[in-house]
């Protein structure tokens, strides 16, 4: 009805926001599926990780991924420099020193080496969803969420709030 | 500023209907979940109803199923809960509240309306 | 459902003294590594006001003599030391799952 979605206007300036604090409020190590409980699963091939999305075989062990939680402020969308409430991003890291970053250009989810203090391509704003589940929106292009796409991880941009709901953009979080 | 304004309270009947409004201003309002608490007179604080932002999915307390709707209307930000069959423990204050961005808990609240189910 | 039980129902305390208030869950409100448990402070004739999110964490605008802890079913909300405007009815509130439920509530009442 505007020309611009409500999840792209609102959250066009989601890179503007400020993570509080340097250290994340918590951690969770998690395995990490699909809505369709396939596994995302990470290998080591030619010195690089590559990102899957499989069935697992019985008994087979799920990867585990570590989940870093950060507050921050969510920037408003009236004047661009209030502050409308606060909002949780996380990191995700299947491994030490690598998290899973978004590349914007190639609309790919890749696994990158990096220290200490992460790039804003590592940020995702988590979505509670219904279902159990939960989506992950990328810091550095708002309405740009991890999904999945021919059985690896990718980018999607969600064109409007109806399609948040999306099982492709829908991941459940397990400890198990 | 981010503001929520509620309107349609009043004085009903036992099994009247009566529909709430939520007026919505200073953010986006498709991209939020909203929802309806309530609080008797002098009582605490009671979760009636939730709809996501892209209208969904809806949650409702047991004790209004089948009895109230929640409902959106995006083009004019404005959020609604029909209330029928109405009973004398609806009588309360509804306030109306929008999730944080990412939907983890409630973070702005309207001032509220006073319903009153008496005969 | 989850029963969030508050303590003590009253709390007596004088301008600049310390308050802790208690909130116990019949189960656990974690979820995802979050414990999603929330805090809420209201004043006569106004809305609740959101003071604490995941059990730790303020607000916008919440002054830092508000702070929360706990994790599990146990928590807890401690004003460092109280001010004036502090003397209101305090909720918690769980939104770990529908349908999402209030402590009974406790009131900061001045002694």
């Known amino acids: 009805a505007f020309g611009i979605s409500g999840v792209q206007k609102y959250t066009r300036a989601l890179h503007d926001s400020s993570i509080t604090g340097i250290s994340p409020i918590t951690e969770y190590l998690a395995s990490l599926s699909t809505y369709n409980d396939q596994s995302i699963t990470f290998a080591l091939e030619d010195e690089s990780y590559e990102i899957y999305v499989e069935d697992l075989k019985k008994d087979e062990k799920k990867d585990k991924v570590l989940l870093s939680y950060y507050e921050s402020q969510h920037p408003s969308n009236e004047s661009g420099d209030g502050v409308d409430g606060k909002m949780l991003m996380v990191t995700l890291s299947p491994t030490k020193d690598f998290w899973l970053h978004a590349n914007n250009k190639e609309h790919s989810v890749e696994l990158h080496k990096c220290e200490k203090p992460l790039p804003d391509q590592a940020f995702f704003v988590l979505h509670n969803m219904h279902s159990n589940c939960v989506s992950f929106e990328c810091k550095t292009d708002p309405g740009v969420f991890i999904g999945v796409k021919d059985n690896h991880l990718a980018l999607i941009k969600v064109d409007s709030s109806e399609n948040l709901c999306t099982e492709n953009i829908l991941f459940k979080l397990s400890e198990t | 500023e981010v503001q929520l304004v509620e309107s349609g309270g009043g004085l009903v009947q036992p099994g009247g209907s009566l529909r709430l409004s939520c007026a919505a201003s200073?953010?986006?309002?498709?991209?939020?979940?909203m929802s309806w608490v309530r609080q008797a007179p002098g009582k605490g604080l009671e979760w009636v109803a939730t709809i996501s932002g892209g209208k969904t999915f809806t949650d409702y307390v047991d004790s209004v199923k089948g009895r109230f709707t929640i409902s959106r209307d995006n083009s004019k930000n404005t959020l609604y809960l029909q209330m029928n069959s109405l009973r004398a423990e609806d009588t309360a204050v509804y306030y109306c509240t929008r999730a944080n961005y990412g939907n983890w808990f409630f973070e702005v609240w309207g001032q509220g309306t006073l319903v009153t189910v008496s005969s | 459902e989850i029963v969030l039980t508050q303590s003590p129902a009253t709390l007596s305390l004088s301008p600049g003294e310390r308050a802790t208030l208690s909130c116990r869950a019949s189960?656990?409100?974690?979820?995802?590594?979050?414990?999603?448990l929330n805090w809420f402070q209201q004043k006569p004739g106004q809305p609740p006001r959101l003071l604490i999110f995941?059990?730790?964490n303020r607000g916008s605008g919440i002054p830092a003599r508000f702070s929360g802890s706990g994790s599990g079913t146990d928590f807890t909300l401690t004003i460092s030391s109280l001010e004036p405007e502090d003397f209101a009815v305090y909720y918690c509130q769980q939104s770990k799952e529908v349908p999402f439920t209030f402590g009974q509530g406790t009131k900061v009442e001045i002694k």
């Open positions: 995941a059990a730790s």
């Open positions: 189960e656990s409100v974690a979820k995802y590594g979050l414990s999603l």
């Open positions: 200073g953010f986006t309002f498709s991209s939020f979940s």
